[in-house]
Structure formats: structure tokens, C-alpha cells
């Protein structure tokens, strides 16, 4: 399809090398085709769009991506091309940083169905490029944590080494969403609910004499709770003894419950203990069964292929340790009578 | 802080012997329990031989009857004498010592390859 009628916009991503960071782009359709195909739960039930050209699809994407080659060739599909790219609905997610990602990015409806449909379409002009070393040390991260409960903030990485006076207008978009009550480098949030979490993007204008470009950063805002006080507890085993048969295959499992932590080490092993010998036992990884808010659920399994006589004069041991302190629980196996 | 560092490793042909030695310095104890473990190439690691500041063992069953673990608990250095050697024995052998639960230490590994 020709592009030349596509409107434009040119967009910059300043990526940091210290830190993991995703950029994101918006379908900025004109307004009617981007009320009905991205934002349909902003309209309601009374509300119609002043056009409605495209057919709703629930299986396809609503839009179509494609990059631009800079030699000329035929437009690339974004999906088959770009595994690091994600195509959701309306917006573009870039999983990994790098200059790589620069170039010319085109979105359109994916259902064609006038000739109005056609002229639908936006370019946007990416450039990417490492953020330069004499940035301040302390610009925000990528990732940001509110406490539940409590007063916090939302920094825009791009300005967050600006005061608040020098800093330019900044656009808010939340999971998408356009953010119309804050122009400021940093949204302060009275209180926080879970609601706030999301991934946050902020938009500035930065101009030269020659043209103006928008400068992109996303943030990942998690809502959490404070850190626990608390050592994990063993939830399983609860006995202290299992009884068994002899010669058939055995699996032990320990499930500990882990208090939620920012930084978050949890260890599980088994170990074990034969008279004065004892030793860490090679047992398969352990795994997150259930996570919550405020917890975590880990379960680790010791497998004996067949319980020999040996193994009833053993003990095995479930260690679990957090940054707080360390429990124990330890199985006795007794012959089934 | 504790250093395990492993020697004795190397090629060797199916049925040949090596000895593998394992010196630790630093805060190791001679009550803490010392032993090798194995990881071969794209494998789990697995337990190989442990012994205790008394002498009581604990063997895999795959190398039982053809590895045989020892200690020196003055020189604080761990040994295990590998006979009758098969492929199936080629891994990066690691050093083991355990203080309690939750504290252990490992050494780099020293690689046995038993190939023809």
C-alpha cells in the first residue's frame, strides 16, 4: 500500500545500558478509527464514533505493523520478522534496547473495507540510541516500586535529573491510556492502591532548529508491600515421620511459604542426615506454586527411586531461608506395618 | 572464607584409575562433613561420595565397589580413588563441604574424561 499519506511522527528512545528497559509504540490512528479500534472501553454503551470504516475482529490484532526497510525494499511484517517485537492491539512493544531498533515503523487498520480505510495510517520515525555517560547517575529506573498503602511517586527516567521547574510538558499514558491530570516529570500519588500498577510511558518534545522529536521512556510500576519480618514457615511436611513400603519409589515434597521481600533470595534444600554425616541432596529445581501480594509458595521434591532399609535409618531434612532467618523440618520414613 | 581446590583430574581410558584430591583452607572444621559431587555434561549434579570427621561414608550406588573416599582431617584434604573407570563416569567432579544446613561450599570441579 502507498505510504506517502501516511501522517507522521518521529520519536526517540534513550536507552540506558545499565538497566533492562522496554519502549513502547501507540497506533495514533486520527481519532475516530482510534476511538473504535484501541480504546472501545473509553466509549460508552451511548457513545458511537463519528466513523466506524473497520470490522470488529476478536481473534486478530486490531492494527497492522510493519517496519520500513531504509534500502527501499517491499514493508515488513513486524510479526514474522521481529521476535523481540510484540504486536498487542494497538501499541508496538519493544522487549530488548539497542540502535538495531532504529528505523521507520508504519500502522494501519487491519480490516480494509473503504477507500477512506486506506489513507488510515501512521509512520513513525524510531531512533534509538544508548543514552550518553554524562547523564546524571541517579535518573530513575525503568522498573519502580509503590508501596501499598502509602504516598509515592512516578518518575519520567528521560527527566527525572531535572528539576521540576526546568522540566518540559510531559505526557502521561498509563496501560495506554492517556493520563490527563498530570503535565510533570513525576506523577505523586497520594495513596496507593493496586490499580497503579501498570506500565507507564511518558512523552516530552525536544526540538531544534530542524525538527522536533517526541522522547519516549516506559516505566513498569509494581504495587507492593512492605517487606516481611518474618523467617519462611514450613508448610509440608507437617509430620515429622512418613510411614512407607519398602522398594517402592518415594517423593517428599516441602512446600514453604516465603514472606514478600524486594529483593527476593529465597533458598530451599533438602538435606540429608546418616549418624554424623550430612549432605546437600541433588533434587530437581524448586518451583513457585502460588504468588501472591504478600507471599510466595515454593515447593521442592526429594525423589528416592526405591526406599531401601538404609533410608529408614536416615533423616531428611527441608531447609528453607529467607534474608530474615532459616527453618527446618525433618522426616523420619517408618515401615509400613 | 572457604577455598576448596580440586587436582587429579584428566583423560583416562575405560578401566584406568585417577585419584582425585581436594585440599580446603580457610575456616573449614574437621567436624564439617566432606565429600565429591559430579555434573556431567547436560546433567544435574549428583552426589558422588561423602565422608565425616569419623570416617562413616556414603556412596552413590553407581560407584559403589569402584570409588573409594578418605580424609585427612589434619591436613584438611579430601581424597577419592577411582577404579574401574567407564564413559559414564566423564563429568566435572566438585569438592563438597558442609558446616551445617544452609552452609556449603564448593570447589571449582576438576574434569575426568573416560574415553578410548
Known amino acids: 500500500f502507498n505510504i506517502s499519506g501516511c501522517s507522521t511522527k518521529k520519536l526517540l528512545w534513550a536507552y540506558s545500558t545499565r538497566s533492562e528497559e522496554e519502549f513502547i509504540l501507540f497506533c495514533d490512528l486520527p481519532e475516530p478509527q482510534k476511538s473504535h479500534f484501541c480504546h472501545r472501553s473509553q466509549l460508552s454503551p451511548t457513545q458511537v464514533p463519528d466513523h466506524l470504516p473497520f470490522t470488529d475482529s476478536k481473534d486478530l490484532p486490531d492494527v497492522q505493523w510493519y517496519r520500513q526497510p531504509s534500502n527501499g525494499d517491499p514493508l515488513e511484517d513486524i510479526r514474522k520478522s521481529y521476535p523481540h517485537i510484540i504486536q498487542d492491539k494497538c501499541t508496538l512493544r519493544f522487549l530488548t534496547p539497542g540502535v538495531n531498533n532504529t528505523g521507520s515503523y508504519i500502522c494501519r487498520p487491519k480490516m480494509i473495507k473503504s477507500p477512506y480505510d486506506l489513507a488510515c495510517c501512521v509512520k513513525m520515525i524510531l531512533e534509538v540510541k544508548p543514552q550518553s555517560n554524562a547523564s546524571c547517575e541517579n535518573s530513575a529506573s525503568h522498573k519502580q516500586d509503590l508501596l501499598l498503602g502509602s504516598t509515592g511517586s512516578i518518575s519520567c527516567p528521560s527527566l527525572s535529573c531535572q528539576s521540576d521547574a526546568q522540566s518540559p510538558e510531559v505526557t502521561w499514558y498509563k496501560n495506554g491510556k492517556l493520563l490527563s491530570m498530570t503535565r510533570s516529570n513525576r506523577i505523586v500519588v497520594d495513596e496507593v492502591y493496586i490499580y497503579h500498577q501498570g506500565t507507564y510511558v511518558c512523552d516530552y518534545t525536544q526540538s531544534d532548529t530542524a525538527s522536533s522529536w517526541t522522547v519516549r521512556a516506559v516505566v513498569q510500576v509494581r504495587t507492593i508491600v512492605g517487606d516481611t519480618k518474618l523467617k519462611p514457615d514450613i508448610l509440608d511436611p507437617v509430620e515429622s515421620t512418613l510411614e512407607v513400603e519398602l522398594g517402592k519409589p518415594l517423593t517428599i515434597s516441602c512446600k514453604a511459604r516465603f514472606g514478600f521481600e524486594r529483593v527476593f533470595n529465597p533458598v530451599m534444600k533438602w538435606y540429608i542426615k546418616d549418624a554424623d554425616l550430612e549432605w546437600e541432596v541433588s533434587v530437581p529445581e524448586a518451583k513457585s506454586i502460588k504468588s501472591t501480594l504478600k507471599d510466595e509458595i515454593i515447593e521442592r521434591n526429594i525423589i528416592l527411586e526405591k526406599v531401601t532399609q538404609r533410608d529408614l535409618r536416615r533423616t531428611f531434612v527441608c531447609f528453607v531461608q529467607n534474608s530474615i532467618g532459616n527453618t527446618t523440618q525433618s522426616v523420619q520414613l517408618k515401615e509400613k506395618r | 572464607e572457604v577455598q576448596l581446590v580440586e587436582s587429579g583430574g584428566g583423560l583416562i581410558q575405560p578401566g584406568g584409575s585417577l585419584r582425585l584430591s581436594c585440599a580446603a583452607s580457610?575456616?573449614?572444621?574437621?567436624?564439617?562433613?566432606m565429600g565429591w559431587y559430579r555434573q556431567a555434561p547436560g546433567k544435574g549434579r549428583e552426589m558422588v561420595s561423602v565422608?565425616?570427621?569419623?570416617?562413616?561414608?556414603n556412596y552413590a550406588d553407581s560407584v559403589l565397589g569402584r570409588f573409594t573416599i578418605s580424609r585427612d582431617n589434619a591436613k584438611n584434604t579430601v581424597y577419592l580413588q577411582m577404579n574401574a573407570l567407564r564413559a559414564e563416569d566423564t563429568a566435572v567432579y566438585k569438592c563438597?563441604?558442609?558446616?551445617?544446613?544452609?552452609?556449603?561450599?564448593w570447589g571449582q570441579g576438576t574434569l575426568v574424561t573416560v574415553s578410548s
Open positions: 580457610g575456616s573449614i572444621s574437621s567436624r564439617d562433613t
Open positions: 563438597y563441604a558442609h558446616r551445617t544446613y544452609g552452609v556449603d561450599y
Open positions: 565422608i565425616s570427621s569419623s570416617g562413616n561414608t
